[in-house]
């Protein structure tokens, strides 16, 4: 039988087959953000470098205007790291003044937007209280998981405070996705 | 037509095909480090277990002398976790003494070395200020992302202070990569 | 030759081939835990949502009674994030009282259970001292790596203190695995 050499020994045929090298993939890296006014209680989205340095998009995975566009339905692994940096958090100042001690926090959310659905879906969230004693602090939040996405879905990364994002190096803050 | 059952319904043929099981893969685990002299401003590289316990290399992905050797070009997912542990950081001692309050830090870098290029390329960095109040502290830094690598590239993990790396358990500190 | 278009140009045939879409995959999300009695020095396992919202299991990857069941041997990428939250840790109270300063900690372990082997195997551990100054603290621990698993292996996520796990949102605490 022709083509039989492709079938596992128990004669089960898996379909469809495709080369791994042609799957949609992207790795985006940080640039200095251009902050704009955003709605209260709505975290601003980051924008990204998609061509230079370590960044790339391939096989119909496109980046436009803060969004990664999903070109075909399937299961994707999605990841992001955001490195935050700041001065002593307000929390420690409040503590010293003896006032109520609500910690500051840093949050990263990977969000899915589907045109047919009015509300964005939060896929992944990393959130951390920041109550640092030192005068300058910095730390990363990393996220990654697998999700079933549909063609046309859009992915973005939102953060609690865009001014705290470390934009200095492409290896510190990044965002990526690939079809499994 | 024989073999047609492998083609997606829209008749697009993807090539080349390959079995997933023969892709280069490695998961390396921590061993106690033998600190060596390293240049100022250059973070030392960790060495790893590549055979025993949870560690393995397969399908031409080889480990030698602190490096994972990339046997074929393609897109790889690369990851590492380093668990650090230490005594109260200098930062808090400095703080108590009323001196300038520059925080200590812990840093992990996944680095690519290409023989044709003299300088290593930092692919991923996780860096965190450490200004702990407790007498003993411990915490992990996790990194993972996808990169386009070339046959012959070498990967290593560098850390800011090798003496702070927790080498006690293979599940706490590790390094891996696999071809997508 | 029919089917030859699937073979790479150098005539090497990779086998067995299979479609990516039929590989075992799961992404599980947090639910409120029902704490049970567990042995001292043994971390309790989390149970998970496996169908609703972002959660799914597919292609013979099944979830039952806190375990993900591995349906076929191979290399799997396994990941989890657990977000912890708590009140001021005991550590700071101890510190204020001038007693020895042993920090509290939070720990996540991804564990493999093999029926033929009496002891569970710890695959991944993320552990962090918690010595927070603020009154309320919260933070995630993320883990992910690749492991060679056997058909019939079972995976679970254990935590140091089930009462500190943030169960409020499916994007904060999750557990997943997929065959590479």
């Amino acid at each position: 039988l022709k083509g039989q050499e492709f079938a596992p020994s128990h004669q089960q045929v898996y379909a469809p087959l495709r080369a791994d090298g042609d799957k949609p993939r992207a790795h985006l890296t940080v640039v200095r953000q251009t902050p704009t006014q955003h709605f209260k209680n709505q975290f601003p989205a980051l924008h990204w470098e998609h061509e230079l340095g370590l960044a790339f998009t391939k096989n119909r995975m496109n980046y436009t205007n803060k969004f990664l566009l999903i070109p075909e339905s399937g299961d994707y692994f999605i990841y992001s790291q955001v490195t935050f940096r700041g001065m002593t958090s307000e929390c420690s100042e409040i503590r010293q003044a003896g006032r109520p001690n609500k910690p500051d926090s840093i949050t990263v959310v990977i969000t899915k937007v589907t045109d047919s659905y009015p509300e964005p879906t939060q896929l992944l969230m990393g959130t951390k209280s920041v109550c640092e004693v030192g005068s300058n602090w910095f730390q990363p939040i990393y996220l990654g998981a697998m999700f079933s996405l549909q063609e046309g879905d859009k992915l973005m990364v939102n953060v609690s405070d865009i001014s705290l994002v470390d934009y200095t190096k492409e290896d510190k803050t990044f965002f990526g996705a690939f079809l499994l | 037509l024989k073999g047609q059952e492998f083609a997606p319904s829209h008749q697009q043929v993807y090539a080349p095909l390959r079995a997933d099981g023969d892709k280069p893969r490695a998961h390396l685990t921590v061993v106690r480090q033998t600190p060596t002299q390293h240049f100022k401003n250059q973070f030392p590289a960790l060495h790893w277990e590549h055979e025993l316990g949870l560690a393995f290399t397969k399908n031409r992905m080889n480990y030698t002398n602190k490096f994972l050797l990339i046997p074929e070009s393609g897109d790889y997912f690369i990851y590492s976790q380093v668990t650090f542990r230490g005594m109260t950081s200098e930062c808090s001692e400095i703080r108590q003494a009323g001196r300038p309050n520059k925080p200590d830090s812990i840093t992990v870098v996944i680095t690519k070395v290409t023989d044709s290029y003299p300088e290593p390329t930092q692919l991923l960095m996780g860096t965190k200020s450490v200004c702990e109040v407790g007498s003993n502290w411990f915490q992990p830094i996790y990194l993972g992302a996808m990169f386009s690598l070339q046959e012959g590239d070498k990967l290593m993990v560098n850390v800011s202070d090798i003496s702070l790396v927790d080498y006690t358990k293979e599940d706490k500190t590790f390094f891996g990569a696999f071809l997508l | 030759l029919k089917g030859q278009e699937f073979a790479p140009s150098h005539q090497q045939v990779y086998a067995p081939l299979r479609a990516d879409g039929d590989k075992p995959r799961a992404h599980l999300t947090v639910v409120r835990q029902t704490p049970t009695q567990h042995f001292k020095n043994q971390f309790p396992a989390l149970h998970w949502e496996h169908e609703l919202g972002l959660a799914f299991t597919k292609n013979r990857m099944n979830y039952t009674n806190k375990f993900l069941l591995i349906p076929e041997s191979g290399d799997y990428f396994i990941y989890s994030q657990v977000t912890f939250r708590g009140m001021t840790s005991e550590c700071s109270e101890i510190r204020q009282a001038g007693r020895p300063n042993k920090p509290d900690s939070i720990t996540v372990v991804i564990t493999k259970v093999t029926d033929s082997y009496p002891e569970p195997t710890q695959l991944l551990m993320g552990t962090k001292s918690v010595c927070e100054v603020g009154s309320n603290w919260f933070q995630p621990i993320y883990l992910g790596a690749m492991f060679s698993l056997q058909e019939g292996d079972k995976l679970m996520v254990n935590v140091s203190d089930i009462s500190l796990v943030d169960y409020t949102k499916e994007d904060k605490t999750f557990f997943g695995a997929f065959l590479l």
Partner: antibody
Framework: QVQLVQSGAEVKKPGASVRVSCKAS????????MHWVRQAPGQGLEWMGW????????NYAQKFQGRVTMTRDTSISTAYMELSRLRSDDTAVYYC???????????WGQGTLVTVSS | QSVLTQPPSASGTPGQRVTISCSES????????VNWYQQFPGTAPKFLIY???KRPSGVPDRFSGSKSGTSASLAISGLQSEDEADYYC???????????FGGGTKLTVL
């Protein structure tokens, strides 16, 4: 692909003003800071300032404060640099440059020669 | 006021290795990365090296950058006649909130 196309050469008299435009294409205009850099004949590069095309916020080098104004029109993805009270030593090629990774100026316009002569 | 100092000129013969230095007068900016630009006569500068030592795709691997402390350098190995150009280093100056350029180095291939 990213392109920055600048307006043509200008000849101005001392005391006059000049406005140079920079039309961007191939990327989201509002997502990246736009800088202006000038180069006098036979001299090196001199940074003048940047504009945030999203908010319109600006930051000018101290040397040019009070004389330079950077604006943008997002509807046509164009940035502008206006320099007033021109002097002969303002004769230079003026470049717009888009900021990118590592806060580097990753894409540059072709340059606009401004000649100030009485 | 911070200053980046480059030698005004450098030269070499084809095939040689040439190094251009860039030193920072103010250690306050020593923590920020150095970028390098190449400019041919009559054309706009071109992005050459970023983050001290990284090359954008399309830049030949004959070009390499390095940085130690407050001093950076650009090395060109296997010098070619088409490398004759002006080379500028730059770093982000937090006080300026903008890039600070070196004075430039004119490279001549003899």
């Amino acid at each position: 692909q990213v392109q920055l196309v600048q307006s043509g050469a200008e000849v101005k008299k001392p005391g006059a003003s000049v406005r140079v435009s920079c039309k961007a294409s191939g990327y989201t205009f509002t997502g990246f800071y736009m800088h202006w850099v000038r180069q006098a004949p036979g001299q090196g590069l001199e940074w003048m300032g940047w504009i945030n095309p999203d908010s319109g916020g600006t930051n000018y080098a101290q040397k040019f404060q009070g004389r330079v104004t950077m604006t943008r029109d997002t509807s046509i993805s164009t940035a502008y640099m206006e320099l007033s009270r021109l002097r002969s030593d303002d004769t230079a090629v003026y470049y717009c440059a888009r900021e990118g990774i590592a806060v580097a100026l990753t894409y540059w316009g072709q340059g606009t020669l401004v000649t100030v002569s009485s | 006021q911070s200053v980046l100092t480059q030698p005004p000129s450098a030269s070499g013969t084809p095939g040689q290795r040439v190094t251009i230095s860039c030193s920072e007068s103010n250690s306050d900016i020593g923590t920020n990365a150095v970028n390098w630009y190449q400019q041919f006569p009559g054309t706009a500068p071109k992005f050459l090296i970023y983050s001290n030592n990284k090359r954008p795709s399309g830049v030949p691997d004959r070009f390499s950058g390095s940085k130690s402390g407050t001093s950076a350098s650009l090395a060109i190995s296997g010098l070619q006649s088409e490398d004759e150009a002006d080379y500028y280093c730059a770093t982000w100056d937090d006080n300026l909130n903008g890039p600070l350029f070196g004075g430039g180095t004119k490279l001549t291939v003899l």
